[in-house]
């Protein structure tokens, strides 16, 4: 799945600069590409480490450049390696001196298993020495000096994979520096076969493409693309999708292209020779000019593209009539997609003619895994491939590639996928309060594991041993209603982030139990002061149907001091409680309920004052009104909180002795007026009012005067009495 290309410029080294450039075309591989010496092929070559640099002219390429003064150190075998999914893709090549005694016919030679092979070297220097031939540095053959032919050949009948390797030729007095190299590549399978047992027929690879024995795919020569290598690239371009360009003034002249085995090395289309610096002669095209144009209708033979078909014709020889082929295009694929971890169904949509088939559309993950479509359909002018990734995870983030490879060409579109971790609360929700049929819950989504933002929250709840139900919630505090009393519940929160499948795994579970339905409050509640520091609460005896033990919970609070609160548990068989250790002259509020395991309902609040620790103040706002010849109305107000138990009205006729007064004692402190009766007409009286509590009576500051009216015959003596 990696488009790795090694450009050897030039394999025959003279005194000029020479280089190796390794290009990972299409998209960035996971691991860096490396260039090194191929000691497997040639053990005794130079040991100096290579100075590998980044090729600044390309997005993802490495380069080794030798200056002319380093010429003596260059001879040997080299490789470029890229890794995908831990598997190495290695491309091999060689460099040799242009002044070598022999030169190979080709830099590499690819044959099928079982082929009869002749590896040949051309004698370019005549010497009176034996010629020697080596394979991977090991001696295989010698030719006596007087028998060295112009073409030195190694004959291999029935080629086998173990015959593959680097063959070198030199005179016996020479060395690595004067050796010529050629590499034999032997396909594991017989011609036109591929597969583990070589039983599957290869696609016919056009334009000298080579069928890969492991995949059955065509490795296309530089300048051709597509499933069958039928589609010619634009001149001076190369790579699986023809996206790479030769930057030289004459295009790909002097560039030897090496591709993964079993392709080997060749010139780009339109060029031939060991140095790829000879243009194809008329009527020839393709890599190494090995292809001949046989244009059906005498169309132009282009040395780069072959027959240039006129409108309405197609095929290598323009022999087919019909709609012209259109290189596939990938449509509507965004550059960046954010997805949630879990199931992922990426879609690749492509146009072109013929429309791509399901087998021609693939998706390549960042680790190099190639996915085939799970679902496929044709819509309008497009092929739509739907892929299924059952579990996409954050490590799958990176550059994915939609790849379409048809007879009309190949196109790849990289796009970035960012896989987000689904959010999951770190803590269980908190139960703030519960009743017999409700629970108040704090659904705090923070902190959470995974990626935000949080789009929505679901509160999952269920009675233990039942199915989960959920409610979408927005607020942090939520009241869950309509619960069953005295039931164990489980709660958890599920968070969701934006996008399809954004719901995370529910967080930790919280258990709680709803209360039982409570008993009614005690009946006949009465709250009375007992002393300056105690109040007495009483109620009627309690009878329940429940077998559960019960008790009375009494809550008392001071109305003056809000922090002063006490809850007292009273055994259920008692009917009163003394609330002691209170503050004198303070008002308290008290309520009670009957609790079993469940809490009962609270009673209404009762209020009472503790007895006073000081004398009461004088009644205030004393008024004498409605005076007649024998009656007068006396009114007053008293200040609350002094445990006033009675009011004393004392009156006497002016001028009479002190001991001749009359006292009226009103024992109901809530009475605020009294009618004095039986008074003498036209008489002046002195009236005093006292408040009385547990400590004593108040001290009047002054007496109030009252003078009755003259006698009126109409008024009858009805006797003294109070008027409320």
């Amino acid at each position: 799945a990696m488009d790795l290309i090694l450009i050897n410029s030039l394999p025959l080294v003279s005194d000029a600069e020479t280089s190796l450039t390794c290009i990972a075309s299409g998209w960035h591989p996971h691991e860096p590409i490396t260039i090194g010496r191929d000691f497997e092929a040639l053990m005794n070559q130079h040991q100096d480490p290579l100075e590998v640099t980044q090729d600044v002219t390309r997005e993802w390429a490495k380069k080794v450049v030798w200056k002319r003064e380093k010429a003596s150190k260059i001879n040997g075998a080299y490789f470029c390696e890229g890794r995908v999914r831990g598997q190495a893709i290695r491309i091999r090549t060689m460099k040799m001196r242009q002044q070598a005694s022999f030169l190979p016919a080709t830099l590499t030679m690819t044959v099928d298993r079982g082929d009869n092979v002749n590896i040949s070297f051309k004698k370019v220097l005549i010497k009176e020495e034996d010629a020697v031939i080596y394979k991977n540095g090991s001696f295989i053959h010698s030719v006596p000096r007087h028998e060295v032919p112009d073409i030195l050949e190694v004959h291999l009948p029935h080629a086998q994979p173990q015959d593959a390797g680097v063959y070198s030729a030199r005179y016996i007095g020479g060395n690595l520096f004067t050796s010529a190299f050629t590499r034999l590549i032997v396909r594991r399978c017989e011609a036109q076969k591929w597969g583990p047992d070589c039983s599957r027929p290869c696609t016919t690879c056009k334009n000298n493409g080579v069928c890969h024995e492991d995949t059955g795919e065509c490795i296309c020569p530089p300048g051709f693309m597509g499933r069958t290598c039928e589609k010619a690239c634009e001149p001076h371009t190369f790579g699986r999708t023809c996206k790479e360009r030769c930057s030289g003034p004459e295009g790909c002249k002097s560039y030897v292209f090496c591709l993964p085995d079993p392709y080997g090395c060749s010139c780009a289309t339109g060029w031939r020779g060991l140095q790829c610096n000879e243009a194809c002669p008329s009527g020839y095209y393709g890599p190494d000019c090995k292809l001949r144009c046989h244009c059906t209708n005498e169309e132009i033979c282009d040395r780069f593209q072959g027959c240039l078909c006129s409108q309405g014709w197609q095929g290598l020889q323009c022999e087919k009539e019909g709609r012209p082929r259109m290189t596939p295009q990938i449509e509507d694929l965004p550059d960046h997609i954010e997805v949630n971890s879990g199931k992922f169904n990426p879609i690749c949509k492509a146009s072109g003619w013929p429309l791509p088939t399901s087998e021609e559309m693939t998706l390549v993950k960042p680790d190099g895994t190639v996915l085939q479509p799970n679902d496929f359909n044709y819509t309008d002018r497009f092929s739509v491939a739907i892929f299924t990734v059952n579990r996409v995870l954050p490590p799958d983030s990176g550059v994915w590639v939609c790849s379409v490879n048809t007879v009309a060409g190949m196109v790849e579109k990289p796009f970035n996928i960012s896989v987000k971790v689904l959010p999951e609360p770190l803590h269980a929700p908190n139960v703030i309060d519960t009743g017999h049929n409700f629970a108040i819950i704090n659904i705090s989504s923070e902190p959470y594991f995974g990626d935000g933002p949080i789009k929505s929250k679901k509160l999952f709840y269920k009675p233990v041993n039942q199915a989960w139900k959920y409610i979408e919630v927005t607020n942090e505090i939520f009241t869950l209603n309509y619960l069953e009393p005295r039931t164990d519940y489980e709660l958890c929160v599920q968070l969701a982030r934006p996008g399809e499948g954004g719901e995370g795994h529910p967080g930790p579970v919280r258990r709680f139990t709803t209360a039982s339905i409570g008993l009614p409050p005690p009946r006949g509640l009465s709250l009375l002061p007992k002393s300056q520091t105690a109040l007495n609460l009483t109620w009627q005896p309690i009878f329940t149907n429940s077998e559960d033990e019960f008790y009375v919970e009494v809550e008392r609070r001071s109305l003056q001091t809000t922090s002063d609160q006490q809850n007292i548990k009273v055994p259920g068989n008692l009917t009163s409680v003394l609330l002691s250790n209170l503050v004198p002259r303070e008002q308290y509020t008290v309520r009670a309920r009957v609790n079993t395991k469940a809490q009962g309902e609270w009673s209404e609040e009762l209020r009472a004052w503790t007895l006073s620790d000081i004398l009461p103040p004088q009644p205030e706002n004393i008024k004498i009104s409605n005076i007649t010849d024998s009656t007068a109305m006396v009114s007053w107000t008293i200040v609350d909180g002094y445990s006033i138990s009675s009011i004393i009205i004392r009156y006497k006729v002016q001028g009479k002795n002190e001991d001749q007064h009359i006292d009226v004692k009103i024992k109901n402190a809530t009475v605020t007026q009294y009618q004095l009766k039986g008074l003498e007409p036209e008489t002046t009286y002195h009236v005093d009012i006292f408040a009385e509590n547990n400590i004593g009576s108040s001290n009047p500051a002054f007496s109030h005067e009252l003078r009755t009216l003259p006698h009126s015959p109409a008024s009858a003596d009805l006797g003294g009495g109070k008027m409320l």
Partner: antibody
Framework: EVQLVESGGGLVQPGGSLRLSCAAS????????ISWVRQAPGKGLEWVAR????????YYADSVKGRFTISADTSKNTAYLQMNSLRAEDTAVYYC????????????WGQGTLVTVSS | DIQMTQSPSSLSASVGDRVTITCRAS??????VAWYQQKPGKAPKLLIY???FLYSGVPSRFSGSGSGTDFTLTISSLQPEDFATYYC?????????FGQGTKVEIK
Amino acid sequence: EVQLVESGGGLVQPGGSLRLSCAASGFTFSGSWISWVRQAPGKGLEWVARINPYDGNTYYADSVKGRFTISADTSKNTAYLQMNSLRAEDTAVYYCARNNRFPTWFDYWGQGTLVTVSS
Amino acid sequence: DIQMTQSPSSLSASVGDRVTITCRASQDVSTAVAWYQQKPGKAPKLLIYSASFLYSGVPSRFSGSGSGTDFTLTISSLQPEDFATYYCQQSYTTPPTFGQGTKVEIK
């Protein structure tokens, strides 16, 4: 697994003939060279002859040229050494050996068969 | 024919010793030399080919070197199973020729 099995050895009178066979298995017979190497009792190794079964090319040691003939039947994956005009100095253990791809070293050897030339 | 001369013709050594056997060719044979081990009553076994390449399955205590006319077989630490006769062979030209052998015996 590569195997070479010689047969046909025995006692023969001087001037007599003998045909040795070498049955090969476990490799591509026609893609290898097959040699015969002999070892006289208590002596060193001496190369006798070789053949390329693919094209029938043959080579002989000077000591046996004209008397011995090496041949191969690719349909049976078998090489033969026809020995005529045998001499006492031909007495030896005869090994069939494979040269693999090129006529260089011998990477597989048979167990050997003894040829005794005596009156 | 190219003559291959081995020395010594025999040697005595102990287990653990470093043993060196040399072979001289009568003319330049490049690196076209192989070394074999033979035990009594058995066929020879290939140890080294092309002067310095260790044949597969052969222990790494065996090594070969040389080029041109002078070649060496070295056993870095002699083992009990290494007591045998060793032959060099040139394959530079036809006929291939063998050295006369070196017998390695227990001291």
